[in-house]
């Protein structure tokens, strides 16, 4: 029962997380105009991964897409790629995990197959979450760098007479949505991996071992120990795995180098 609950909860949490990653990717407010120096602006600027927008106090909002591909900063392209990879992996993970759910019966699918699918989807969710967190973090880092660069030369003037305030950008709502969504997807993935351990109908047979103590001839012979977890599993379909407990696959993320433009 606990395994089913863990798997189900992992699926739901990942589903919410991936929906959040999709929402964050589509959102226009990745960076918003910093109003610290001009809190009473009649024009508010904000930017997303795909377009930049200007909202006037009149209520009129104008958005312009980034129609160029080569002219965009490499960092922005990298963030787009990370978010899309996260969405794709998450979507595939969701598809796999639906068939892996213990509450759904598909023909005579064995528990071992469901366990493998649960593990696969779990890993996909973990990588998906990491991609989203990495993407959002890269963008946030880019914002922080640009923020302090623009602060350094905030005011440029003609003989000190005319002020030209450079527009600075700060964290937008999409960043927080992305971080939370990435975190949820990651947690969901971990839960799926935990559920996989319970789903696997492991039956480990320990071979009889004789221990010969000096001066004594006492043999310790433990019987075949059956480790079986998983509620309501069909024992006649169980396969016996020899050679100890299985470990979860490790997710390795390879750092990639992107240049600022």
């Amino acid at each position: 029962m606990a395994v089913t609950a863990c798997q189900g909860l992992g699926f739901v949490v990942s589903l919410i997380g991936i929906a959040g990653i999709i929402a964050a990717t589509c959102m226009d407010q990745w960076s918003t105009q910093d109003l610290y120096n001009n809190p009473v602006t009649a024009v508010f600027n904000y930017q997303g991964l795909w377009r930049s927008c200007v909202r006037e106090s009149s209520g009129f909002t104008e958005c312009r897409g980034y129609f160029t591909l080569l002219g965009l900063p490499a960092m922005l392209q990298a963030v787009r790629a990370l978010m899309i990879v996260g969405i794709v992996l998450g979507a595939i993970g969701l598809l796999v995990s639906i068939f892996a759910l213990k509450c759904i019966r598909i023909g005579s699918m064995e528990d071992s197959a469901k366990a493998n699918m649960t593990l696969t989807s779990g890993i996909m969710f973990i990588v998906s979450g990491l991609c989203a967190i990495a993407g959002v973090s890269v963008f946030a880092n880019m914002l922080v760098t640009n923020f302090w660069m623009s602060t350094a030369n905030m005011y440029t003037g003609m003989g000190g007479m005319v002020q030209t305030v450079q527009t600075r950008y700060t964290f937008g709502a999409a960043l927080f949505v992305g971080w939370v969504a990435g975190g949820l997807t990651l947690i969901g993935g971990v839960m799926m991996c935990i559920a996989c351990r319970g789903l696997a109908p492991e039956e480990t047979n320990y071979k009889a071992v004789s221990y010969h103590a000096s001066g004594h001839s006492v043999a310790y012979k433990p019987g075949g120990f059956k480790a079986s977890t998983g509620f309501g599993s069909n024992t006649k379909n169980k396969k016996i795995y020899d050679g100890g407990a299985r470990t979860e696959d490790e997710v390795q993320s390879y750092p990639s180098k992107h240049d600022y433009v």
Epitope: N38, A42, N45, S58, F60, V162, Q163, T167
Partner: antibody, heavy 119, light 113 residues
Framework: DVQLVESGGGLVQPGGSRKLSCAAS????????MHWVRQAPEKGLEWVAY????????YYADTVKGRFTLSRDNPKNTLFLQMTSLRSEDTAIYYC????????????WGQGTSVTVSS | DVVLTQSPSSLTVTEGEKVSMSCKSS????????????LTWYQQKPGQTPTLLIY???TRKSGVPDRFTGSGSGTDFTLTINTVQAEDLAVYYC?????????FGAGTKLDLK
């Protein structure tokens, strides 16, 4: 057709109060920011105050801050300007205008209501 | 606050003449987000309410004759009337619509000889 009709003007004693109204029609009042602009006799235009569509943002000119209060009643399509502690320099024609157009431009203006502050 | 300085304060021209008036801002009215200047020009004929002529510093409002041209960027703006007509007798105001308070210039009065 967009129409803005101001009312509530008249003669007021210094230190007195007055409430101006602006009835709007011909457009979705609740979707647009509204402004008050005044013009003293033989003088130029002076922006007075602004209120956003949902009353979330309200801004005032420094000359009226703390004395004037701007509000709106969206269901009744009406804009209000409550003026207190009136001074002789507040004597002007008060126009209500809307940022109906692009670029925060004040496209539609009312005919104005005259406020005279005098003893 | 943004201070707008209009010059000259008054102009006397003959019909058919080309006229230009200036509006200088104490701060830049250029918005990098959409590459637009948030300066508006209004016309106020004697005894009438102001009417919008130009927004975004150079975009004519529909219905405004093409003899009216707005130009400039950042802090320096100009309103040009190519062939002045009798009906153009009015006071012309520029307005900062970039940050609150939305200040107006003192105006340029256009008179005909």
């Amino acid at each position: 057709d967009v129409q803005l009709v101001e009312s509530g003007g008249g003669l007021v004693q210094p230190g007195g109060s007055r409430k101006l109204s602006c009835a709007a029609s011909g457009f979705t009042f609740s979707s647009f920011g509204m402004h008050w602009v005044r013009q003293a006799p033989e003088k130029g235009l002076e922006w007075v105050a602004y209120i956003s569509s949902g009353s979330g943002s309200i801004y005032y000119a420094d000359t009226v801050k703390g004395r004037f209060t701007l509000s709106r009643d969206n269901p009744k399509n009406t804009l209000f300007l409550q003026m207190t502690s009136l001074r002789s320099e507040d004597t002007a024609i008060y126009y209500c205008a809307t940022s109906y157009y692009y670029g925060n431009a004040l496209e539609y203006w009312g005919q104005g209501t005259s406020v005279t502050v005098s003893s | 606050d943004v201070v707008l300085t209009q010059s000259p304060s008054s102009l006397t021209v003959t019909e058919g003449e080309k006229v230009s008036m200036s509006c200088k801002s104490s701060q830049s009215l250029f918005n990098s987000g959409n590459q637009k200047n948030y300066l508006t020009w209004y016309q106020q004929k004697p005894g009438q309410t102001p009417t919008l002529l130009i927004y975004w510093a150079s975009t004519r409002k529909s219905g405004v004759p093409d003899r009216f041209t707005g130009s400039g960027s950042g802090t320096d703006f100009t309103l040009t009337i190519n062939t002045v007509q009798a009906e153009d007798l009015a006071v012309y105001y520029c307005q900062n619509v970039y940050s609150y308070p939305l200040t107006f210039g003192a105006g340029t009065k256009l008179d005909l000889k």
